[in-house]
Interface confidence: medium
């Protein structure tokens, strides 16, 4: 088992909103849960966009999940990752 490296980034979206993206990379096996949470509770699927779980050329995999949030509410959102029985939570950078 190779645990993922998780990285959260933010980018400007429409006025007053930002897109936050959570990327998991270099993990094996390919089964992973990656989702955004607001106040600890998972967002619905239709408010998130997922990338495919793709091989990264090193025998491991990568994927991402993104959602759009209101600027100023970043503290309320965290990226939740679960892989091979381990889990972690990652905040939005300020």
């Amino acid at each position: 088992t190779v645990p993922p490296m998780v990285n959260v980034t933010r980018s400007e979206a429409s006025e007053g909103n930002i897109t936050v993206t959570c990327r998991a990379s270099s993990f094996y096996p390919r089964n992973i849960i990656l989702t955004w949470r607001q106040d600890g509770v998972a967002l619905s699927h239709d408010t998130q966009q997922w990338g495919d779980v793709l091989p990264d050329g090193n025998g491991t995999y990568q994927t991402w999940v993104a959602t759009r949030i209101c600027r100023g509410e970043e503290q309320r959102f965290t990226c939740y990752m679960e892989h091979s029985g381990n889990h972690s939570t990652h905040p939005v950078p300020s």
Epitope: D39, G40, V41, L43, T47, R76, T78, H90, P91
Partner: antibody, heavy 122, light 112 residues
Framework: QGQMQQSGAELVKPGASVKLSCKTS????????ISWLKQKPGQSLEWIAW????????SYNQKFTAKAQLTVDTSSSTAYMQFSSLTTEDSAIYYC???????????????WGQGTLVTVSA | DVLMTQTPLSLPVSLGDQASLSCRSS???????????LEWYLQKPGQSPKLLIY???NRFSGVPDRFSGSGSGTDFTLKISRVEAEDLGVYYC?????????FGGGTKVEIK
Amino acid sequence: QGQMQQSGAELVKPGASVKLSCKTSGFTFSDNYISWLKQKPGQSLEWIAWIYAGTGGTSYNQKFTAKAQLTVDTSSSTAYMQFSSLTTEDSAIYYCARHDYYGTSGAWFAYWGQGTLVTVSA
Amino acid sequence: DVLMTQTPLSLPVSLGDQASLSCRSSQNIVHINGNTYLEWYLQKPGQSPKLLIYKVSNRFSGVPDRFSGSGSGTDFTLKISRVEAEDLGVYYCFQGSHVPWTFGGGTKVEIK
């Protein structure tokens, strides 16, 4: 389900600050969201803020953003709330409570501390 | 803020009676993930509140089946099918769907 043990009663003077503690045991501290709540005598409850023990991330009720500061010490599995510039309006029982997002997929205040009475008086 | 209004303020009951408590929110309390985070708590004198019901109708672990929750949108109800002495106290409804999370003013269930 674990335990949440809060610090003892406090008698403080107006304008002072107080730091309340909530020591936890019996569960993985860093996995949990912990909220603080206020209850004035004979009244209902108010949610102050939560802190995620794993990252220290917080979310505050705007009413308390200038009043409360939440922190955690993962080495001792303890959550803290510092309340500043106290007035008699801050006299209340303050509770810490643990969220249960895992076992029940969304119960807010599943487990509570016993409360700390804060009295603000000159 | 979402205002949670509970009625009645006081509910005198006889042991063994059914009790019905009402909670109304000032706006729809469906979370953006589609769930309705409406909860009921019981607080007995001198004690911390205890969670009874979460997500409108789910009993928390250890809560007797005489407690049931129902409702949707803005109107919610807690029913106690046969009131026992240990059920006396103040019941609070709570919404966790919109920040700031808010409680109702409470309904005191007491002996008639």
